[in-house]
């Protein structure tokens, strides 16, 4: 019975000489009982985050599919042999008789696989979205907590001011906000959260204790403290917050900086300064003055700046409201104007008036198309974005081109008048804009943007301050960004409010300047509130932003420069030469691959901006102290990250996607510094229950920790 009999398709083969090598038949019987080993079908690559059940289902379907494919292949072979007149054995005949069934099963299995893969992808998307939402909620909660800490620090700080104490006791409308007893309680609590240095304890132990007190206060625990409970203390603090006492401008005499109009002069030849020995902390002013505006968010309605999740934004977050056009820099083109650069010496000035003058001059420069985005607003398809990352985009979707080299403008120092009511803010750490731009548009046809700096040589004792930010924006990124419909384009540079372009002044004394840690979010597009679909543009904004902050007015070795760039790292590093055009001093550096994590002499930003003056290690970690004039002084330690990132080492955003723990480590080279100067009052003494000389560091516990990898 030539297997003839084999009805179940027993493999007997054709009538002719049996086909070689066991191409036996009937195995093809539909349904193929035994799962054949894999053939043709690639494994269903569905994603890393796949539920186990889904993986198993897809695995089974895949196996079945491969089996059926194999079977169908055999049947096709049998069919062909039959057509040639060859005799098949019973197993083969049985198999062939099931051809239609096998074909149907195969189609069904394919359809099933497609469905499950789609389902799997949906599940993954949902998981990702949920995770992202949870992450955002965590970050938002964290940010709110941080905000509360900052507010608390600000209030506690201000309570050292006799005038503030008196105001709070008297109240705004005769109704006392705080009693003497409550002030005393806050004074006592202040000593817990900013304790005197106890040399018997390790510093981090001491601050650990302080942080526990802060935490318990934020939690409003019923635990006893300072003769009361954290809950009571929290209520007292909240009462102060709710009184809006610190919001009213009469309490903060604002030093207003005059606005400066940029004089667009015709081309002026670059003046290349001669190389001369200069102090390490010298900066060159950029050659074009721009009018920009630094908006004090404390005086803006919170609701004006909300994320897609309608989160409330910390009132002290900084937001740039208007955008001036991008700075156009033609290769070897002359600078439109040559302002008289002012000098900023790296050390604190003895004369408060001079210091005020310096501060005002720098504050006037605080303009630039940066939107300081709070982290909780970032709902982005890719990995969670780091808080200390800046997102730079073209100003509108139609401008599809590389970003130019963007440089901070200089200010005419002689145009400044000392303002008597100004708070003496340390000049070493002044908020400066990272980017400025001219009023001229530029087109995509200009592939290279070379800086033109016309500055005079300065005597050594008058070094010129300049911060240059070079942002290299991959053309792919701008293209991707521009290709989105205007409605869904995250308008990072667009004006957020209807404030005029040139504001009448800058509030130097407002709370944010004294207490708010500015976090730059670069490379983090804000998805429009109504258009979650933009989240799907996965690779849209993963550009390489190499931000270079040079402290040299003259050209130096490139390797040295690379170690002196701001530690702002985002996305996947693209080190190709055509993506990075560095501007350094008055010379254009040849494009080259920048290290992703270079060292910076200005490694962090706080509300006072880039700390100036202290050489590395000179004054420690921005440990401010109040001198007799109650002016804030502080040094900083340039932070050198312990991780390297050569262009090929592949640091991507996922390295930093874990929820931030500000107390435990340093994020991305930004020193989380919360030491603040106070207002104008005299040194805090007896009212705070601490006799003796004024205490250094009347601010929050030092939160300057080192980055860990």
């Amino acid at each position: 019975m030539p297997s003839a009999t084999s009805h179940s398709g027993s493999g007997s083969k054709s009538s002719g000489p049996p086909p070689p090598s066991g191409s036996s038949g009937s195995e093809a019987a539909a349904g193929a009982g035994a799962a054949a080993p894999a053939s043709q079908h690639p494994a269903t690559g569905t994603g890393a985050v796949q539920t186990e059940a889904m993986k198993q289902i897809l695995g089974v379907i895949d196996k079945k599919l491969r089996n059926l494919e194999k079977k169908k292949g055999k049947l096709d072979d049998y069919q062909e042999r039959m057509n040639k007149g060859e005799r098949l054995n019973q197993d083969q005949l049985d198999a062939v008789s099931k051809y239609q069934e096998v074909t149907n099963n195969l189609e069904f299995a394919k359809e099933l696989q497609r469905s499950f893969m789609a389902l799997s992808q949906d599940i993954q998307k949902t998981i990702k979205k949920t995770a992202r939402r949870e992450q955002l909620m965590r970050e938002e909660a964290e940010q709110k907590r941080l905000k509360t800490v900052l507010e608390l620090q600000y209030v506690l700080d201000k309570l050292g001011d006799d005038e503030v104490r008196t105001d709070l006791k008297q109240g705004l409308n005769g109704v006392p906000i705080l009693s003497e007893e409550e002030l005393s309680l806050l004074d006592e609590f202040y000593k817990l959260v900013d304790p005197e240095r106890d040399m018997s304890l390790r510093l981090n132990e001491q601050y650990e204790h302080a942080s526990i007190h802060l935490w318990d206060l934020l939690e409003g625990k019923e635990k006893p403290v300072c003769g009361t409970t954290y809950k009571v203390l929290k209520e007292i603090v909240e009462r102060v917050f709710q009184s809006n006492y610190f919001d009213s401008t009469h309490n903060h005499q604002n030093g207003l900086c005059e606005e400066e109009e940029a004089a667009s002069a015709p081309a002026v030849e670059d003046q290349v300064p001669e190389a001369e020995p200069e102090p390490a902390e010298e900066y060159t002013e950029q050659s074009e003055v721009e009018s920009t505006e630094y908006v004090n968010r404390q005086f803006m309605a919170e609701t004006q700046f909300t994320s897609g999740e309608k989160e409330q934004v910390d009132e002290w977050t900084v937001e740039t409201v208007e955008v001036v056009n991008s700075l156009q820099q033609q290769p070897q083109a002359a600078s439109p104007s040559v302002p008289e650069p002012h000098s900023l010496t790296p050390v604190a000035q003895a004369d408060p008036l001079v210091r005020r003058q310096r501060v005002q001059d720098l504050m006037a420069q605080m303009q630039g198309p940066y939107n300081f985005i709070q982290d909780s607003m970032l709902d982005f398809e890719n990995q969670t974005l780091d808080p200390a990352i800046v997102s730079a985009q073209p100003m509108n979707p139609t401008q599809n081109m590389d970003m130019p080299q963007l440089v901070c403008p200089p200010v005419h120092s002689e145009s400044r008048l000392a303002q008597p009511n100004q708070v003496p803010v340390q000049p070493e750490a002044t908020q400066v804009p990272l980017v400025s731009s001219t009023s001229e548009g530029y087109t995509a046809s200009q592939p290279l943007y070379q800086p033109s700096h016309a500055t005079e040589q300065r005597p050594q004792k008058e070094p010129i301050d300049q911060i240059q930010a070079t942002i290299s924006l991959n053309t792919d990124q701008t293209t991707a960004s521009s290709s989105l419909p205007a409605a869904s384009q995250p308008q990072v540079f667009q004006a957020g409010t209807s404030k005029p372009l040139h504001s009448s002044g800058i509030n130097v004394n407002a709370a944010p300047f004294q207490s708010m840690q500015t976090v730059f979010n670069m490379n983090a597009p804000v998805p429009p509130v109504n258009e979650p679909e933009t989240l799907k543009q996965q690779n849209q904004y993963q550009a390489s932003y190499n931000q270079s902050f040079s402290s040299q007015p003259h050209q130096v070795e490139q390797t040295e420069l690379q170690q002196e760039q701001l530690q702002t790292v985002v996305g996947t590093y693209h080190g190709s030469p055509d993506q990075s055009h560095q501007v350094t001093g008055n010379h254009q550096q040849p494009p080259q691959q920048n290290t992703g994590f270079p060292r910076s002499n200005q490694p962090y930003y706080n509300s006072r901006g880039v700390s100036r003056g202290g050489s590395r290690g000179a004054r420690g970690l921005m440990n401010g102290y109040r001198g007799p004039a109650n002016g804030f002084r502080g040094g900083y330690d340039g932070y050198r990250p312990s991780f390297s990132n050569t262009p090929n080492s592949g640091y991507t955003q996922s390295q930093f996607s874990a929820p931030r723990d500000y107390s435990g480590y340093q994020r991305d080279g930004y020193q989380q510094n919360f030491k603040r100067g106070s207002g104008q009052s005299g040194p805090r003494g007896a009212p705070r229950g601490r006799g003796g000389p004024p205490r250094p560091n009347r601010g929050m516990p030092q939160m300057n920790t080192q980055q860990v990898n």
């Epitope: 297997s3 084999s6 191409s23 054995n89 019973q90």
Partner: antibody, heavy 114, light 112 residues
Framework: EVQLVESGGGLVQPGGSLRLSCAAS?????????MSWVRQAPGKGLEWIAY????????AYANWAKGRFTISRDNSKNTLYLQMNSLRAEDTAVYYC??????WGPGTLVTVSS | DIQMTQSPSSLSASVGDRVTIKCQAS??????LAWYQQKPGKAPKRLIY???NLDSGVPSRFSGSGSGTDFTFTISSLQPEDIATYYC??????????????FGGGTKVEIK
Amino acid sequence: EVQLVESGGGLVQPGGSLRLSCAASGFSFSGSYYMSWVRQAPGKGLEWIAYIYIGDGVTAYANWAKGRFTISRDNSKNTLYLQMNSLRAEDTAVYYCARGNKLWGPGTLVTVSS
Amino acid sequence: DIQMTQSPSSLSASVGDRVTIKCQASQSISSYLAWYQQKPGKAPKRLIYDASNLDSGVPSRFSGSGSGTDFTFTISSLQPEDIATYYCQCTAVSSATIYGNAFGGGTKVEIK
């Protein structure tokens, strides 16, 4: 239910003839099937006799069966036949019909004895 | 006719033992081979077709392998219900080169 039932067995004298039938039920003889006859002598192994392809009637025989045994089918009756001539004592066995090599009938006993 | 030689003709093994039966064809038959189990007084039951494919409903402890002239049938873990005689059969369609659907002599499997 698909099944095969053999009949026609019994006692026959040596040199005599016998015609075995195999009635198929549950499936039609019009399909692509090989129908076979297999026998098994008492206490011995299985021995293939012949097959016929229902579709076109092509047949094949074991060498020892050629000339004495004939396989045929009647598609209209859904029946398979085995004509045995010149029977010998050694032809005593249980005779099975099978469709392909998967479906077997229970068998019918043929005894050749004088 | 093609000749099929099966060995051993009988074997005795313990429950749980691995049992192997060989079948050799007098000429290459590719993979056109079936294995049967026959219990006393019953018709044979096919277990394996095309040398290695397990029939539906057959326990996975039964397996087959080989092609050409040498084939092997294995019971990975002998069970009491496996006591039977096992046969191999060439299932090729008769042709000028391969003729007949001969059976092997059978292997009687017993439990020790």
